[in-house]
Interface confidence: medium
Amino acid sequence: SGVFQLQLQEFINERGVLASGRPCEPGCRTFFRVCLKHFQAVVSPGPCTFGTVSTPVLGTNSFAVRDDSSGGGRNPLQLPFNFTWPGTFSLIIEAWHAPGDDLRPEALPPDALISKIAIQGSLAVGQNWLLDEQTSTLTRLRYSYRVICSDNYYGDNCSRLCKKRNDHFGHYVCQPDGNLSCLPGWTGEYCQQPICLSGCHEQNGYCSKPAECLCRPGWQGRLCNECIPHNGCRHGTCSTPWQCTCDEGWGGLFCDQDLNYCTHHSPCKNGATCSNSGQRSYTCTCRPGYTGVDCELELSECDSNPCRNGGSCKDQEDGYHCLCPPGYYGLHCEHSTLSCADSPCFNGGSCRERNQGANYACECPPNFTGSNCEKKVDRCTSNPCANGGQCLNRGPSRMCRCRPGFTGTYCELHVSDCARNPCAHGGTCHDLENGLMCTCPAGFSGRRCEVRTSIDACASSPCFNRATCYTDLSTDTFVCNCPYGFVGSRCEFPVGLPPSFPW
């Protein structure tokens, strides 16, 4: 569909005569009839197959014709057509004299014709006006013409229909050849597919409008390139959705069991060395001068009772000093100037001469010790408490205060690792020398029976159209990650495609 446009420029009839040679009275009141038809090698009378148009009276004798000229006429003249433009045409332009106001053919005398021109040729669709001029013995007509397409028609022959749109069915404008040109942010054959946010993950993200990035189940982040770990995962990460891969030093189904208490909590004080010894269990090896489960207590150097023979100990900045009783000397009052004659043994100790009476030795009764039986026996000096237990004197006896995880008189027994029921999903726990072992029921595996194996919701391949299946361990259900173009809990529905368009 298009329009043949004819622009009349100038008509010259200097003598004001008709084609017969007869002059017009008082002058030739000139109007035009135009006939457009298919190409003929010799233009002949007959139907105006492409259309006809007439003008009102445009002037007298010689005159120039302006755009949208006065008198109600349209210039350029419009000859619309509703077919594919063939690229060739024939054109007949007749100039007539109107003696009165009635311009109908039957109302005019037969000799009212002033001039008649006929041309034929090639004409491509385009904006350019093609200039032409025809001269006869008495008249001259200058005009130009072109063919343009109607609104929404495009191409070399105005045969291609294209209507711009910006709605659910497409987002485009039309190019000069009728092809679609997508609006910014849209792509696809009919410009229906939004262009997602730059960098939006191809599989894990999608969009319903341009510059958007919506995440499929199991994915998160601005570009949908971060997986969502298992619900409740504390100290773990994932590489695919719903995983919980524990960070170093953590264990358990949700990576919430601390396997590296030393690093995470630094419990040992005063420069002590920390050793992990199980879940939330540790041992501190104290530096000299410190004691306590966490080496939090500072030892006085006199606490070890270094002064013998009843010597009294005095703490000093750089150590300690023994004040010896009469008859003793040395760093620890270990040397005696006494003999058995001086009755040096206390608390009922019996004296024995040595080195021909130059020295002696005391044999102490139970509960007393020291070179002169001057000290009550400290039952803790032998460090009887195992596994870092703390020894406490209780009168004539002693007792051990055990660290968590140990029991027994001397803290020599491990509290059963199985007491905490560490095996998940009904697993059976076995205490071992260095830890425990879980025997898992059918359908579970892993150190603590935390991994489901046989009950796999994805095993039945529930997802359609090449979707990726993920098992949600916490609910025994599956999640389908749909490829582009499919929706539904199992990706079973194709996204509705538009009806095909005629262009």
Epitope: D67, A124, W129, L131, D132
Partner: antibody
Framework: EVQLVQSGAEVKKPGASVKVSCKAS????????MHWVRQAPGQRLEWMGW????????KYSQKFQGRVTITRDTFASTAYMELSSLRSEDTAVYYC??????????????WGQGTLVTVSS | QSVVTQPPSVSAAPGQKVTISCSGS????????VSWYQQLPGTAPKLLIY???KRPSGIPDRFSGSKSGTSATLGITGLQTGDEADYYC???????????FGTGTKVTVL
Amino acid sequence: EVQLVQSGAEVKKPGASVKVSCKASGYTFTSYTMHWVRQAPGQRLEWMGWINAGNGNTKYSQKFQGRVTITRDTFASTAYMELSSLRSEDTAVYYCARSRYNSGGSLVDYWGQGTLVTVSS
Amino acid sequence: QSVVTQPPSVSAAPGQKVTISCSGSSSNIENNYVSWYQQLPGTAPKLLIYDNNKRPSGIPDRFSGSKSGTSATLGITGLQTGDEADYYCGTWDSSLSAEVFGTGTKVTVL
């Protein structure tokens, strides 16, 4: 890209004829009018005539009427200008020029490179 | 005798402005569009201005055109040495039914 490529320089004797060609490309040949314009050494531009490439209709300047013939070959997209009865004052550069037309007159928008015609005995 | 006349020459220093007039009549300039062409030495003319005041793509805005009655004017601002050329106006003459060109103006950059 619109291009008009003309034939090479010619040397002619007085009384002879010369035919200059102008090959068009980069646009629809039949949708435009082709003008011919000449320029004698040190002189202004002088319009000679035009041809409607769609239907072959021609219009000539009164100064050259009877001596100039403009034709076209639509299949070769080429226009021709033939000038006969050459005289020494016809020595000039001859240009073909494409014309666009609108309601206010024609507009020469692209020119050939020119062809020098020398008329000398 | 030409129907459209121009001054033979104009000159100005670099960076200055020059104007070239084109004088005609009602049968040409007054009732038809005017075009301006630049012809550098030894080359074909090149379209500078069409439809009185429009510039084709690639022509800098230093070149401008205007029309009033039977006269048209070409203005060149920020004159450059590369602007040294002959400048012609062109229009349609209805009475001659012919394309007509002005007599041409040589622009010299001092």
